[in-house]
Amino acid sequence: YDFTNCDFEKIKAAYLSTISKDLITYMSGTKSTEFNNTVSCSNRPHCLTEIQSLTFNPTAGCASLAKEMFAMKTKAALAIWCPGYSETQINATQAMKKRRKRKVTTNKCLEQVSQLQGLWRRFNRPLLKQQ
């Protein structure tokens, strides 16, 4: 999906009002020095592409993020504020339902959500010129 035509300000508002708090709740109890962000993004469409991938694509050691509160709110925000996004996700959602697993918060998931926090922060401030 091409995120170029999303309403970025509306997504930013959804992030600040709800998604950010759910991410903090998920990460509560972890040390602020525990994880090192290795994923970055350079502009808002790029940030949303990375956020979508990390939130909804199962990875080795962390298959369960899509059912978390922050993920459901992310999905809702993208569906509302990105034209045509929900249509592109129908097949992906059906495939995900087939492989749904019990929610387990692993260290790998915590690391992944730490990466997501960094991506969302960069989405929130997409104002930087590369030196």
Partner: antibody
């Protein structure tokens, strides 16, 4: 505990440059942006600019165009702000500040570095 | 640049009083409004971000509200340790800009 420790006070002559450092600890340095803000004696706050500690990307207040350079050293978790062509009105306390967890607002501040510009 | 205007510039109140400080932006800042507290010789402290979200560790007697161009910081019951200068800051548009400050004193 998040801490930002800045370099000591500086006295500079007009036309000179100053480089202020900001050493971060208590969090993963490259995960956050660092902003620079100054405060002239008895005055309000003025935003200078911001650097992404991960990429080194930066942006700054156009007021300081051509005079400010922001850099960082990830090996020492230190951010730097250099201001050149100093004039008397640059006399101020210079603060570094880290963004909040959500990227909105300046949540953690250094203790400030007094830069005095005087002939 | 967006101009931020605070009122009043100074304020005297008694312990236990409800105190409100106003901040007006020269254009709509879409709720990207933060509040800071600064005590003499110290760095500012973030109190509230995005108009009304309390930063971690900030007492619940502090609250924020507003929209568009007009925003308010409220202290529901003034405590002696709240004596400080308060600044608003807009985070909507670069360059970020601050209000001139409101100095709060005890009667």
């Amino acid at each position: 505990e998040v801490q930002l420790v800045q370099s000591g006070a500086e006295v500079k002559k007009p036309g000179a440059s100053v480089k202020v450092s900001c050493k971060a600890s208590g969090y993963t340095f490259t995960n956050y942006f660092i902003d620079w803000v100054r405060q002239a004696p008895g005055q309000g706050l003025e935003w200078i600019g911001v650097i992404d500690a991960f990429s080194g990307g930066s942006n700054f207040n156009e007021k300081f165009k051509g005079r400010v350079t922001m850099t960082r050293d990830t090996s020492t978790s230190t951010a730097y702000m250099e201001l050149s062509s100093l004039r008397s009105e640059d006399t101020a306390v210079y603060f570094c500040a880290r963004e909040s967890e959500v990227g909105e607002g300046f949540a953690y501040w250094g203790q400030g570095t007094l830069v005095t510009v005087s002939s | 640049d967006i101009q931020m205007t605070q009122s009043p510039s100074s304020l005297s109140a008694s312990v236990g009083d409800r105190v409100t400080i106003s901040c007006r932006a020269s254009q709509d800042i879409s709720n990207y409004l933060n509040w800071y507290q600064q005590k003499p010789g110290k760095a500012p402290k973030l109190l509230i971000y995005y108009t009304s979200t309390l930063h971690s560790g900030v007492p619940s007697r502090f609250s924020g509200s507003g929209s568009g161009t007009d925003y308010t910081l409220t202290i529901s019951s003034l405590q002696p340790e709240d004596i400080a200068t308060y600044f608003c800051q807009q985070g909507n548009t670069l360059p970020y800009t601050f209000g001139q400050g409101t100095k709060l004193e005890i009667k």
